[in-house]
């Protein structure tokens, strides 16, 4: 995880500590590194990455997708709404990174700074968020039975579901970071 | 055609007021961030403050802070920058500028406005 | 807060010829933009993140670098090239300049 201390949000800290606005776009640039590597784990091992199949295993998944309603794109943008969308899909998204700590062989280490690293995104953004509406958290046990169901697919569907997560947690990220970065 | 006009420069004392305004036009004002940078006569460029684009967050320099508020009236398209307790360190010419979507840069300036602080 | 130190401070060259300016930084910077500032005017945004072209600069201009040091390059100086150029960097804010480079005819 990228180093960072406390600072304020609002106004302009001195160099030291890292301010607010560039603890976020660095975690979430070492984030996208992180799942870099595991995309090429996963295209190395499987023919995923060009598979057509993909409808058939996004059929068991749920993951956040950001959408116009969210208020994140360009068009329609509005950043309280936005940054709220931005949390909740992250903590959506931590069961689905639970799920891929056994998914890799020689990114294990890696699979677990994603995983990590997203922890602390989430508390940085949950600081600047401390003004906006409370955000929902998911259900443990929703979440316990939808890794258990996860685990339980054949080898074909777990692969895809690794390349999906994967595919679909780099997207949400680079829109969020584009996001971010006017607020 | 894209563009943005700063208004309310001008002469005032050490320790008085100035607002000065930014009209944006061309372009949909309420995605983009705006910052605010100087520039002493003769002098570099100086960034002074920033503003989301609904106004939640605002960041200012060290040299301003306290002393100056970055506001929005996003109904027409237009930012202000409140200037209170001016020095002659403040004078300078004011440039409101417009943050590239998705990143830091400041793709579109004003042309300025001059603030002068002098007794 | 990062300080930017631009080299030369000012140059003199003819049009066709290429020129480096070069921006350095105490510390290890996230993102670099180049600038172009004609006198009486506002700057222009010629180099954003460190190495892409802004919308509507000729191709002539390139930016490069990472970390501490950064370059901008323009290949064949044309007559309207002369003018002042900043770098600009953000890794948090503030956001700040270096003293500029002044780029005049020889």
């Known amino acids: 995880v990228p180093p960072g201390e406390d600072s304020k949000d609002v106004a302009a800290p001195h160099r030291q500590p890292l301010t607010s606005s560039e603890r976020i776009d660095k975690q979430i640039r070492y984030i996208l590194d992180g799942i870099s590597a595991l995309r090429k784990e996963t295209c190395n091992k499987s023919n995923m990455c060009e598979s057509s199949k993909e409808a058939l295993a996004e059929n068991n998944l749920n993951l956040p997708k950001m959408a116009e309603k969210d208020g994140c794109f360009q068009s329609g943008f509005n950043e309280e709404t936005c940054l709220v969308k931005i949390i909740t899909g992250l903590l959506e998204f931590e069961v689905y990174l639970e799920y891929l700590q056994n998914r890799f062989e020689s990114s294990e280490e890696q699979a677990r700074a994603v995983q990590m690293s997203t922890k602390v995104l989430i508390q940085f953004l949950q600081k600047k968020a401390k003004n906006l509406d409370a955000i929902t958290t998911p259900d443990p046990t929703t979440n316990a039975s939808l890794l258990t169901k996860l685990q339980a697919q054949n080898q074909w569907l777990q692969d895809m579901t690794t390349h999906l997560i994967l595919r679909s947690f780099k997207e949400f990220l680079q829109s969020s970071l584009r996001a971010l970065r006017q607020m | 055609e894209v563009q943005l006009v700063e208004s309310g420069g001008g002469l005032v004392q050490p320790g008085g007021s100035l607002r000065l305004s930014c009209a944006a036009s061309?372009?949909?004002?309420?995605?983009?961030?705006m910052s605010w940078v100087r520039q002493a006569p003769g002098k570099g460029l100086e960034w002074v403050a920033k503003i989301s684009p609904g106004g939640s967050w605002t960041y200012y320099s060290d040299t301003v802070t306290g002393r100056f508020t970055f506001s929005l009236d996003t109904s027409k398209s237009t930012a202000y920058l409140q200037m209170n307790s001016l020095r002659a360190e403040d004078t300078a010419v004011y440039y409101c500028a417009r943050q590239l979507w998705g990143y830091y840069a400041l793709d579109i300036w004003g042309q300025g406005t001059l603030v002068t602080v002098s007794s | 807060d990062i300080q930017l130190t631009q080299s030369p401070s000012s140059l003199s060259a003819s049009v066709g010829d290429r020129v480096t300016i070069t921006c350095s930084a105490k510390?290890?910077?996230?993102?670099m933009y180049w600038y172009q500032q004609k006198p009486g005017k506002a700057p222009k945004l010629l180099i954003y993140d460190m190495s892409n072209l802004a919308s509507g600069v000729p191709s002539r201009f390139s930016g490069s670098g990472s970390g501490t040091d950064f370059t901008l390059t323009i290949s064949s100086l044309q007559p309207e090239d002369f003018a002042t150029y900043y770098c600009m960097q953000w890794s948090g804010y503030p956001y700040t300049f270096g003293q500029g480079t002044k780029v005049e005819i020889k």
């Open positions: 061309g372009f949909t004002f309420s995605p983009f961030a």
């Open positions: 510390i290890s910077v996230s993102y």
